[in-house]
Interface confidence: medium
């Protein structure tokens, strides 16, 4: 995947030299104030009929540098009664989300874009049965 | 988050200059191969307990330029006889992304990283009783 | 969950001494630059002294050159800040921070402690 200007508003830049080492202003921008980064964990993990488990994903040459990865902790969805329901499924939730590598030795600094899927939590669906024919 | 204007991990790098000019490849590479891009959308978001709809947020000038939001369908969640249970809710799971955004009329070509705060899916959670002193 | 508690701060003379404190946890801390940054009243940020992860490095603004000294111990997951002959300009809040690989870009930081400088 690249990411390719919408406009040529800018003279002489050619597409493949444009993708490569592009000197951008690289100013990080919290669009939605400090509340994002101080927002509490919900307890959703745990009230959850398909309740998760989440991991630390941790690498100092990433932003963002610690990811949390959710893992559904039972196969089956848990019931009114706190039981595994044989005909209910928890299933990953997942989302790709954008991540900025370090080019390791790098002065001054260079980033790469990277994608990466994570798992953001679980739901519940009903199973599917397969008919024999 | 914050961003302090100052610095220097690399020598003789200005304070001023530190988060003006960095290089960023944007190439996006995939860590996970072609796993990532070709996936197809699940079929959860129908078939859950607590379905949602996807709704797409454009934006031309931002990368991805396409981001799904989820909303969940109903307050409550989708019992075994696909009636509404008013003992459980549907909740919204969000996740924090990071996404480039092209500063406009700029050259050479300027993108800040921005945080945005996204629906992915919905979870069923027992609803919290509030018991009178 | 990424955690950051200051400590360390309170009322001292100029030209007195403070040591402050931040315990870490929620994440590798020897992985880690660590910073020092400062807010005075009315202020914006004032970033005040970084260390890399194995404390080879030190880097300090110039207003605290010579005067500050940044040090850690990974074992304990503890960073401090070594404070002297301190100056009415010293007042402010300090909050120890982690570093991420965006330069001075933070997501973590403590409550902070005040460090009040006055005869």
């Known amino acids: 995947a690249a990411i390719i200007p919408q406009s040529s508003a800018c003279p002489n830049t050619e597409a493949k030299d444009f993708l490569q080492n592009v000197k951008v202003n690289l100013k990080v921008f919290n669009s939605l104030g400090a509340k994002v980064s101080s927002r509490r964990p919900s307890d959703y993990l745990n009230r959850s009929t398909s309740p998760w488990t989440l991991h630390r994903n941790e690498d100092p040459d990433r932003y963002p540098s610690v990811i949390w990865e959710a893992q559904c902790r039972h196969q089956r969805c848990v019931n009114a009664e706190g039981k595994l329901d044989h005909h209910m499924n928890s299933v990953l939730i997942q989302q790709e989300i954008l991540v900025l590598k370090r080019e390791p030795e790098s002065c001054p600094f260079t980033f790469r874009v990277e994608k990466m899927l994570v798992g953001v939590g679980c739901t519940c669906v009903a199973s599917i049965v397969r008919q024999a024919a | 988050a914050a961003i302090i204007p100052q610095s220097s991990a690399c020598p003789n790098t200005e304070a001023k200059d530190f988060l003006q000019n960095v290089k960023v490849n944007l190439k996006v590479f995939n860590s996970l191969g072609a796993k990532v891009s070709s996936r197809r959308p699940s079929d959860y978001l129908n078939r859950s307990t607590s379905p949602w709809t996807l709704h797409r947020n454009e934006d031309p000038d931002r990368y991805p330029s396409v981001i799904w939001e989820a909303q969940c369908r109903h307050q409550r969640c989708v019992n075994a006889e696909g009636k509404l249970d008013h003992h459980m809710n549907s909740v919204l799971i969000q996740q924090e992304i990071l996404v480039l955004k092209r500063e406009p009329e700029s050259c050479p070509f300027t993108f800040r990283v921005e945080k945005m705060l996204v629906g992915v899916g919905c979870t069923c959670v027992a609803s919290i009783v509030r018991q009178a002193a | 969950e990424v955690q950051l508690v200051e400590s360390g701060g309170g009322l001292v003379q100029p030209g007195g001494s403070l040591r402050l404190s931040c315990a870490a946890s929620g994440f590798t801390f020897s992985s880690y630059g660590m910073y020092w940054v400062r807010q005075a009243p009315g202020k914006g940020l004032e970033w005040v002294a970084k260390?890399?992860?194995?404390?080879?490095?030190?880097y300090y603004a110039d207003s605290v050159k010579g005067r500050f000294t940044i040090s850690r111990d990974n074992a304990k997951k503890s960073l401090y800040l070594q404070m002297n002959s301190l100056r009415a300009e010293d007042t402010a809040v300090y909050y120890c921070a982690k570093g991420e690989i965006l330069p001075l870009y933070f997501d973590y930081w403590g409550q902070g402690t005040l460090v009040t400088v006055s005869s």
């Open positions: 260390i890399e992860q194995d404390g080879s490095e030190e």
